[in-house]
């Protein structure tokens, strides 16, 4: 960093709020789609190019002029695995976080024409190609249909779909948001013979209702009704089926074979939480009890002579937690060997760190192939010789990510493939493997500017740089950019990591205002080595505010001792630790302890509010965006994972004493800005409405802003600009900045 004198001498512009809002400085991505083990597609100037991974040469796969006469704006495209057809998506209409409806057309790449017969209907909810060939499965009006050929009629698989009641092949609200992180509840077998699907029944699930004001001309607001199970409420039920798509015929209804949940699940409420095909005729299902500390994996085989699926009890694998819940957010997915007789899975070891364990389907116990006081983040690829994974082992930094390979014939032979490639610039990697893992793209996202490179698995040789963001680098040379510090403090003999976005020419002998940017939900991580251009960049660069984040108890990727510390006790340690972090920061000598603020969104809004309502005296002000205020208001799957049930026999007491409203009196000591979107389907406006009411009832003056018809992301262009401008004014006023 440059010294104090340089700050005044530095005539370069700063990174402004407008720069953030208008995205003046754009990070370039290199988004590729593998189509084979040696080829990928890449979109350049709206042409789709096909690249040879080995040599880097490309040819035009599809010219941008192909669809000039199409008459619709194409939102996305998807090429069939055999390369014969392209699915075009248009008329995109967002629903929730992942779900949307759209229209689709299919273009025949051989005939170079659109298929006009037997088209997929408008308002289709989900479409997916089979893994090989060009079959299509889609969901329309909550029912599943299959096309064997793009130009042939669809075969209807289900007949029970009903809006907001029965969902076939798609998730309801809570499964989409909290279980599968997807709208799709369809799973093709590897060769496309079988189609597995879930059916969700929301008949008894209570509805959340909220007004949608829409256009000014709408005299009466619309009421949106969504089946949404809040903590302790009636949950959706689930059934699971497999249909043989080779059996489909127009003159007879498709026969779907049900696979029932294990007996140990059927005794009470439960979830389907993972579906993974092991082989062409073997499927694994993971089920989870409503009290999410007990899960069962079933491995089911197709019996050709009966056409049924058999799940042997001897092949069941139980995963449980005595200290918290199973998995980071749900049980991890298995990665099967080619023969389907064994698999690798990330589970908690005896010390509470998440590592890879090797299972044989007929044996209960597994063998850990990794170990240490660090965690495996994800299994990325499995070949006959190696398993590739991402972990945060390198240099003992939980906020880093690197790619490793482990030799399956000798687990002691582990190689870090990314650690030494560019150690200053790149400490946080993700990866994208080709179809059979012969090649991989490394995506480095920090601490330096993002870097995309291509590598060969044969010798782990770097083949070429795909994108180095050199143009952005050149632009940012002319900007006074903040620096990022990643370090830890020790509390009760435990390391807790924090990051600080420090103003340009940071001088530790000076006093700076500090904004604590908080999330702090279970298994969260805010202190990492990722490069970001965001609101914090502006605050540090232009307003000379230190923006800090701290991963306290409850945070992830550092073992269950830390993560499970908040089990059954949301709103306690994770809140206290943010306060303690701020105290520690103010002792560092460069923080103006009269100007400490806190802000957060969603869970971060809850923690922000709980911190401001704690009466700690540490914080002058804070902003809560779309906060949870009482856990009984939030959804069952997420909330009960950590809190159990809001019943007297379980954990009702803590549900009741972890509300923001109960701390209303303490808000008299702070300046508070409360913000929420009125059409938030996730954290309902109700949550902020109740905070507001409680504050009014005890005479607290506070600031508030609602965003009409905005959801949990407050992401429309105008609302996004407005909220960040509004929060900037609030923070500047709080810190007495001009």
């Amino acid at each position: 960093n440059k010294g104090t004198d340089d700050a005044t001498a530095d005539s370069r512009k700063t990174y402004t709020l407008t720069d953030y809002l208008k995205n003046t400085y754009r990070l370039k991505l290199y988004s590729l789609r593998w189509i084979s083990d040696h080829e990928y597609l890449y979109k350049q100037e709206n042409n789709i190019l096909v690249f040879n991974a080995e040599y880097g040469n490309s040819s035009v796969f599809l010219e941008n002029s192909t669809f000039d006469e199409f008459g619709h704006s194409i939102n996305d495209y998807s090429i069939s695995p055999d390369g014969q057809f392209i699915l075009l998506e248009y008329n995109y209409v967002k629903q929730w976080r992942h779900s949307y409806t759209a229209s689709y057309d299919i273009y025949d790449l051989n005939k170079r024409q659109l298929i006009t017969e037997e088209r997929i209907p408008n308002n289709t909810q989900w479409v997916t190609w089979s893994p090989v060939g060009h079959k299509l499965a889609y969901v329309w009006n909550n029912d599943i249909y299959v096309k064997i050929e793009p130009n042939l009629p669809s075969y209807r698989i289900t007949w029970t779909g009903k809006e907001d009641i029965i969902y076939n092949g798609i998730t309801d609200w809570v499964y989409e948001e909290e279980v599968f992180s997807a709208y799709s509840a369809l799973w093709w077998s590897p060769n496309g013979t079988f189609l597995a699907y879930a059916q969700f029944n929301d008949t008894e699930v209570p509805l959340i209702e909220y007004s949608f004001y829409s256009d000014e001309s709408l005299q009466y607001p619309k009421t949106v009704r969504v089946p949404y199970p809040k903590a302790g409420a009636v949950n959706p039920t689930v059934k699971f089926f497999v249909v043989n798509t080779d059996s489909l015929s127009s003159v007879t209804n498709a026969t779907s074979i049900q696979i029932t949940a294990p007996a140990s699940m059927l005794i009470g409420d439960h979830y389907l939480c993972d579906v993974t095909w092991a082989t062409q005729e073997r499927i694994s299902l993971q089920w989870l009890r409503r009290i999410q500390n007990y899960s069962v994996m079933d491995i089911c085989d197709y019996d050709e002579s009966s056409g049924r699926w058999n799940c042997l009890v001897a092949r069941q694998h139980i995963e449980m937690s005595t200290t918290g819940w199973v998995g980071r957010f749900r049980p991890s997915e298995p990665h099967f060997t080619l023969d389907g007789n064994s698999f690798y899975k990330i589970i908690s070891n005896e010390e509470g760190y998440r590592h890879i364990c090797y299972f044989q389907i007929d044996k209960k116990d597994c063998t850990f192939i990794t170990k240490g006081t660090w965690e495996v983040i994800g299994i990325e690829a499995l070949t006959s010789d190696y398993l590739y994974y991402i972990s945060n082992e390198y240099k003992g930094m939980p906020g880093g990510r690197n790619l490793y390979k482990i030799q399956l014939s000798d687990y002691t032979k582990v190689t870090c493939l990314s650690c030494e490639l560019n150690p200053e610039r790149c400490q946080y990697y993700s990866v994208s493997f080709s179809k059979e893992a012969k090649y991989y793209q490394l995506r480095c996202s920090g601490p330096g500017l993002p870097l995309y490179t291509l590598h060969s698995s044969v010798n782990d040789k770097g083949l070429r740089v795909l994108e180095d963001n050199s143009a952005l680098d050149k632009m940012l040379q002319n900007v006074q950019m903040p620096s990022k510090k990643l370090d830890f403090i020790i509390l009760n003999e435990t390391k807790f990591w924090y990051q600080m976005i420090l103003p340009p020419h940071f001088d530790k002998s000076k006093k700076y205002p500090l904004l604590l940017d908080v999330y702090a939900g279970p298994c969260s991580q805010k202190a990492d080595t990722v490069f970001r251009l965001n609101w914090a960049t502006y605050l540090a660069s232009t307003e000379n505010i230190i923006v800090a984040s701290f991963d306290g108890r409850g945070s992830g990727y550092q073992g269950d001792k830390i993560m499970h510390a908040i089990n059954r006790r949301l709103g306690t340690f994770e809140v206290e630790d943010q306060i303690e972090a701020a105290r520690q920061f103010s002792k560092m000598g460069f923080v103006d302890n009269k100007r400490i603020a806190i802000w957060g969104w969603s869970y971060g809004g809850y923690v922000t509010s709980m911190v401001l309502g704690s009466g700690s005296g540490v914080f002058k002000c804070g902003i809560a965006v779309a906060p949870v205020s009482r856990w009984e208001y939030y959804d069952s799957v997420y909330t009960e994972r950590y809190m159990g049930l809001p019943t007297p026999e379980d954990n009702l007491d803590h549900y009741r004493n972890s509300t923001v409203m109960s701390r209303a009196e303490n808000f008299k000591q702070v300046e508070y800005l409360l913000i929420h979107g009125t059409a938030d389907d996730n954290v309902h406006f109700q949550q902020s409405a109740q905070i507001s009411k409680a504050l009014v009832d005890v005479g607290v003056d506070f600031q508030a802003m609602w965003y009409t018809d905005e959801d949990h992301g407050i992401a429309s262009s105008t609302a996004h600009q407005h909220i960040y401008t509004h929060m900037s004014h609030f923070i500047k006023q709080c810190f007495s900045l001009p």
Epitope: N151, L152, P153, Y155, D246, S249, S250, V251, E304
Partner: antibody, heavy 116, light 107 residues
């Protein structure tokens, strides 16, 4: 390789019962339906009925009262039983594999003569 | 039941000729029509499914078209091995029904 082989042909008595066997190989009877189609001498093809992959059956109304199609999945065989035989049941009988909405593989056919 | 009417019932053509056989349904069957070839020895093969889709292994000189009630099978360049009887069949509704057949001979 997909194959269907019909057997059980021969001369049958009027009023008697015909039982034909179709031995399938290269595919599963629980996946694909098996149809029976016949062809009287010098005439066209006539659909008789089907046993679907899930074991359900459908018959042409013309044969409904006297035809039964069944199967033994463990032996990978389908059967056609036709009761109350008459002279006009003299025909070549084919078993045929169903694929979606078409018949993609046909057996070679077996000749049945109904005569006293 | 849906009646399928095929014409002509027989036809004679020369090698290399373009031959068209027609089939009409007594009611609309969309595109649910298949064509089969029966050789003189009685062996039956699928040629075209769903009106216009060539079954795997069938020479490209065979093509099908039509929808609703009127369909046709065309052989663009007649070969000696094409001597056979050709049948259309509807598959939209049970009972499945066949046309009466068109016997193709070489002049």
């Amino acid at each position: 390789e997909v194959q269907l082989v019909e057997s059980g042909a021969g001369v049958e008595q009027p009023g008697g019962t015909l039982r034909l066997t179709c031995t399938a190989s290269g595919f599963s009877l629980t996946t694909y339906g098996v149809h029976w189609v016949r062809q009287a001498p010098g005439k066209g093809l006539e659909w008789m009925g089907v046993i679907w992959g899930d074991g359900r059956t459908d018959y042409d109304a013309a044969f409904m009262s006297r035809v039964t199609i069944s199967r033994d999945t463990s032996k990978s065989t389908a059967y056609l039983q036709l009761n109350s035989l008459r002279a006009e049941d003299t025909a070549v009988y084919y078993c045929v594999r169903n694929r979606h909405d078409w018949f993609d593989y046909w057996g070679q056919g077996t000749t049945v003569t109904v005569s006293s | 039941d849906i009646q399928m009417t095929q014409s002509p019932s027989s036809l004679s053509a020369s090698l290399g000729d373009r031959v068209t056989i027609t089939c009409s349904a007594s009611q609309g069957i969309r595109n649910s029509l298949n064509w089969y070839q029966q050789k003189p020895d009685g062996a039956v093969k699928l040629l075209i499914y769903y009106s216009s889709n060539l079954h795997s292994g069938v020479p490209s000189r065979f093509s099908g078209s039509g929808s609703g009630t009127d369909f046709s099978l065309t052989i663009s360049n007649l070969e000696p091995e094409d001597i056979a009887t050709y049948y259309c069949q509807q598959s939209i509704k049970l009972p499945f029904t066949f046309g009466s057949g068109t016997k193709l001979e070489i002049k």
